[in-house]
Amino acid sequence: DWVVAPISVPENGKGPFPQRLNQLKSNKDRDTKIFYSITGPGADSPPEGVFAVEKETGWLLLNKPLDREEIAKYELFGHAVSENGASVEDPMNISIIVTDQNDHKPKFTQDTFRGSVLEGVLPGTSVMQVTATDEDDAIYTYNGVVAYSIHSQEPKDPHDLMFTIHRSTGTISVISSGLDREKVPEYTLTIQATDMDGDGSTTTAVAVVEILDANDNAPMFDPQKYEAHVPENAVGHEVQRLTVTDLDAPNSPAWRATYLIMGGDDGDHFTITTHPESNQGILTTRKGLDFEAKNQHTLYVEVTNEAPFVLKLPTSTATIVVHVEDVNEAPVFVPPSKVVEVQEGIPTGEPVCVYTAEDPDKENQKISYRILRDPAGWLAMDPDSGQVTAVGTLDREDEQFVRNNIYEVMVLAMDNGSPPTTGTGTLLLTLIDVNDHGPVPEPRQITICNQSPVRQVLNITDKDLSPHTSPFQAQLTDDSDIYWTAEVNEEGDTVVLSLKKFLKQDTYDVHLSLSDHGNKEQLTVIRATVCDCHGHVETCPGPWKGG
């Protein structure tokens, strides 16, 4: 029959080539001369010419060694034609199966594999998977079937069989207990992949197993006892650095220390933080300590880690005895800022107030006083008693030194400690108004026409406070009332000056007396420029010249 069973050809054949494979034969060759040909990839299409057929004999030839890993199967068609070219058979399928030779070694996908596993894990824990490939056939033969094994382990501590590898999957697992990062942080395994399911060619690679840190070591204080000296009143003062050792991985949560004041800080005076680099506990004062109240504190500090312990571990405790050192504390004015009401213009030598300070120190220290800042120089202070007296005229209306009726003075108290310390207080004198200023008109110079003159409105000001101001009263003196009139408006805060008789062009003094609600009188001379003009004028016109 015009049929060919699949032809098996081993790869890497040594020849000689051409090499006979099979003879195509049609039983029609009894009747007529038959010519044979083949088509398909490997014959008349790429890769061309690998196979050929002798036209007259039908012998199928192989022209070169085959490579299964390149092409594992060739599908050709055999053709049979008569001398005249007519097809005498249907095209016949010719399958050429390239059988595998173990011509490839296994290859690991990496030279070095890296994996990690937590210290202290139980046997059976998976670490990593390694992979080797083999280009040979692993379906019909064992040529490409890879078996994995561990050739060696370094270091061999605690013993040389800490890991196992699954011979088929390449999964590396822990086989023994005793992984301790603090003793062996990394294992190097030489792994093997062997084809023929373990009986063939071998290749090696390295698997590096990093042992990850677990928090299986507690931080320990070293030393456990500390003595520190702290000056009283210091806030944020570093009291002591507490040192711990921890065998776990530096700068990991299992190593980083967390400190807690367990006892001895009833007043919440202390705080403890962890130094980010040294891991030390930095004990500092949160509030100032008071030597006079308590001169020694005994603190108990416990240390743990940021990460929880993976097993029950005893915690380490440190004892810190903090000695509070006495400091010569500054006297403190009571109150720190003192408000005193005093009438302006009081006589010199008149007492203003007594302003004293207290010393927190228990020794009976002598306090002396002096004025630190008195801008106007109006006051004096008794160094022993703290008595403040007036030595100048207190003037509420002095805009240079008084703001919103308040004159501010800074005083100083100094103790006789060694070295002496000082404290300051602020004395706020609220000056009570006295009617010591009369009313003043504005402006004090006017220009007015001598014909149909416009009334001149002058504003009245008084530096004093109510009730020592409006309503004001006006009166003309020194015969000024012959030519002028002065009237205060209804509100009582302006005076209207009018020219009631003709005056020739010239400059005149108008004597105006103004008095406030408290009858404080002030005489003001108004310079009036009278012009030859009608109605409103600002400056006198020049003399008229005819032309």
């Epitope: 040909s37 010419g49 199928l60």
Partner: antibody, heavy 118, light 107 residues
Framework: EVQLLESGGGLVKPGGSLRLSCAAS????????MSWVRQAPGKGLEWVAT????????YYPDSVKGRFTISRDNSKNTLYLQMNSLRAEDTAVYYC???????????WGQGTLVTVSS | DIQMTQSPSTLSASLGDRVTITCRAS??????LIWLQQKPGKAPKRLIY???SLDSGVPSRFSGSGSGTEFTLTISSLQPDDFATYYC?????????FGGGTKVEIK
Amino acid sequence: EVQLLESGGGLVKPGGSLRLSCAASGFTFSSYAMSWVRQAPGKGLEWVATISSGGHYTYYPDSVKGRFTISRDNSKNTLYLQMNSLRAEDTAVYYCASYYYGIPFGYWGQGTLVTVSS
Amino acid sequence: DIQMTQSPSTLSASLGDRVTITCRASQDIGINLIWLQQKPGKAPKRLIYDTSSLDSGVPSRFSGSGSGTEFTLTISSLQPDDFATYYCLQYGSSPLTFGGGTKVEIK
């Protein structure tokens, strides 16, 4: 009738080159592997080169590899042997021969003499 | 390379004699062996392929046998046309190698 006719032989100096030809007729030249075989005077036969039917693949023994090149022109039904760097020991009658039944040397030419001498 | 050792190198025989020529391969070549006949001044001619298959037109007095490493060519009744030199050739391994030849001459 199968006929193979060699030509191109002659006298050549050592180190010289020569190209032999083999004209084929009487069979489908393009579907048969072809070879060259030589026979030194009074000596036995020695295989020199083979080429696949399509001309894609060539094969040589170590004795001539790198010096001799076999080729074919299927459109002209002609086989060639280019011989370079000729040596005295290459002196022989050179036969072209065809594969037949998938195995060597079913048909032979009458041969052409190559003499390498100074 | 596979060495082919032919024996004898020369053989004297009479017409009608049964003649046997031996070819020994240095390695197993299966049945990949041909026998060639060469007459003086002529091209060789293939007689037998695949150890024992006769080429077309070759008289039936010629036969071949053997496999592996030991092969024989037998002429059952020597004829005048049979006086020639006979060569074996192995094509089981590359390179193709010939035997040294056996010259059959008239006794």
